[in-house]
């Protein structure tokens, strides 16, 4: 039975250039993360982070992603075209898939203001 | 299996800088995120910073910005920490350490570094 | 930054009883917390992540617990090869912390 839950940042927003945390965090359950998987709005994959294998991050990425903190990731350089869903995939043992949604959006303004308050989907 | 192994201690003069290493074997190394520690006798730790070998992207405790400078080389599997204008404070056992999923799962024997005139 | 208390400073026991190590955040960190145990000149060891995950080849009398601020590491039956000091460590931002460790010693 899955009891766990996954907060993430909700929506957020960054300015043009700047970088972003985009995390997730899974709570309520002792199922042990054996991945964790990175996708955007059109489910292209930014990156997976496997517990054995380390980090894979996809060409597309491969100079704007920086690991962590945590098990969330930082994208740097960020573009208007960097606006959109963004989906966090825990593959967990015993319980199987957990799915948390982040919206980004970039804003040109310089008074764009980075929030990362926790919430539940 | 999982190795780091550390270069051997340093003394070194006030002033002066050093660099030491950290080899890993037995994982894809420019995969995994490495990590420095401080740790100075009988004390505590301290997060000195993190890199990422396969972009080199690195992040750094604020405290250590001007201290620390954290290189990798992916083709002989080597993380690299140099510390600079070094004082007495700077004398510490040094540790490497590969993060999985966000845990630091190995860590390095250390690197002792004395600061001395 | 995050600050992490650790209690006692030191806790004297014998080998046979059992302990609890508490570890306080300054602020919210959910379960983004580990234990690390280090013996003298040793390298520290990964105990427990994420506040109560256990690790493979660790003692099953190592357990933790807690989430937010407050967490606690326990060790049921402690044995001689336990004695050495235990930092926890948070991972929820940047810059990741230590907290300065509680010494547990043979009485």
């Known amino acids: 039975m899955m009891t766990g839950t996954i907060e993430t940042t909700g929506n957020i927003s960054a300015k043009k250039g700047g970088s972003v945390i985009l995390q997730c965090h899974l709570s309520s359950t002792m199922a042990q993360v054996t991945q964790v998987n990175w996708e955007q709005h059109d489910h292209s994959l930014l990156a997976i982070r496997n517990a054995e294998l380390g980090w894979h991050i996809y060409p597309a990425f491969k100079d704007r992603v920086a690991p962590g903190p945590g098990l969330g990731l930082t994208l740097q350089s960020l573009t208007m075209n960097d606006t959109g869903e963004y989906f966090c995939t825990y593959h967990t043992y015993p319980d199987g898939t957990y799915r948390g949604r982040i919206f980004l959006e970039v804003l040109e303004s310089s008074v764009a203001e980075h929030s990362a308050r926790f919430q539940i989907p | 299996q999982v190795q780091l192994q550390q270069s051997g201690p340093e003394l070194v003069k006030p002033g002066s800088s050093v660099k030491m290493s950290c080899k890993a074997s037995g994982f894809p190394f420019a995969n995994h995120v490495m990590h420095w520690v401080k740790q100075q006798p009988g004390q505590g730790l301290e997060w000195i910073g993190c890199?990422?070998?396969?972009?080199?992207?690195?992040n750094y405790n604020e405290k250590f910005k001007v201290k620390a400078t954290l290189t990798s080389d992916k083709s002989s599997s080597t993380a690299y920490m140099e510390l600079s204008s070094l004082a007495s404070e700077d004398s510490a056992v040094y540790y490497c350490a590969r993060e999985q999923l966000g845990s630091f799962a190995y860590w390095g024997q250390g690197t002792l570094v004395t600061v001395s005139a | 930054d995050i600050v992490l208390t650790q209690s006692p400073a030191t806790l004297s026991v014998t080998p046979g009883d059992s302990v609890s190590l508490s570890c306080r955040a300054s602020?919210?960190?959910?379960?983004?917390l580990h234990w690390y145990q280090q013996k003298s000149h040793e390298s520290p060891r990964l105990l427990i992540k994420?506040?109560?995950q256990s690790i493979s080849g660790i003692p099953s009398r190592f357990s933790g617990s807690g989430s937010g601020t407050d967490f606690t590491l326990s060790i049921n039956s402690v044995e001689t090869e336990d004695f050495g000091m235990y930092f926890c460590?948070?991972?929820?931002?940047?810059?990741?912390?230590f907290g300065s460790g509680t010494k547990l010693e043979i009485k």
């Open positions: 890199i990422f070998p396969f972009n080199e992207i690195t």
């Open positions: 602020q919210n960190i959910r379960s983004n």
């Open positions: 994420y506040a109560s």
């Open positions: 460590q948070h991972i929820n931002n940047w810059p990741f912390t």
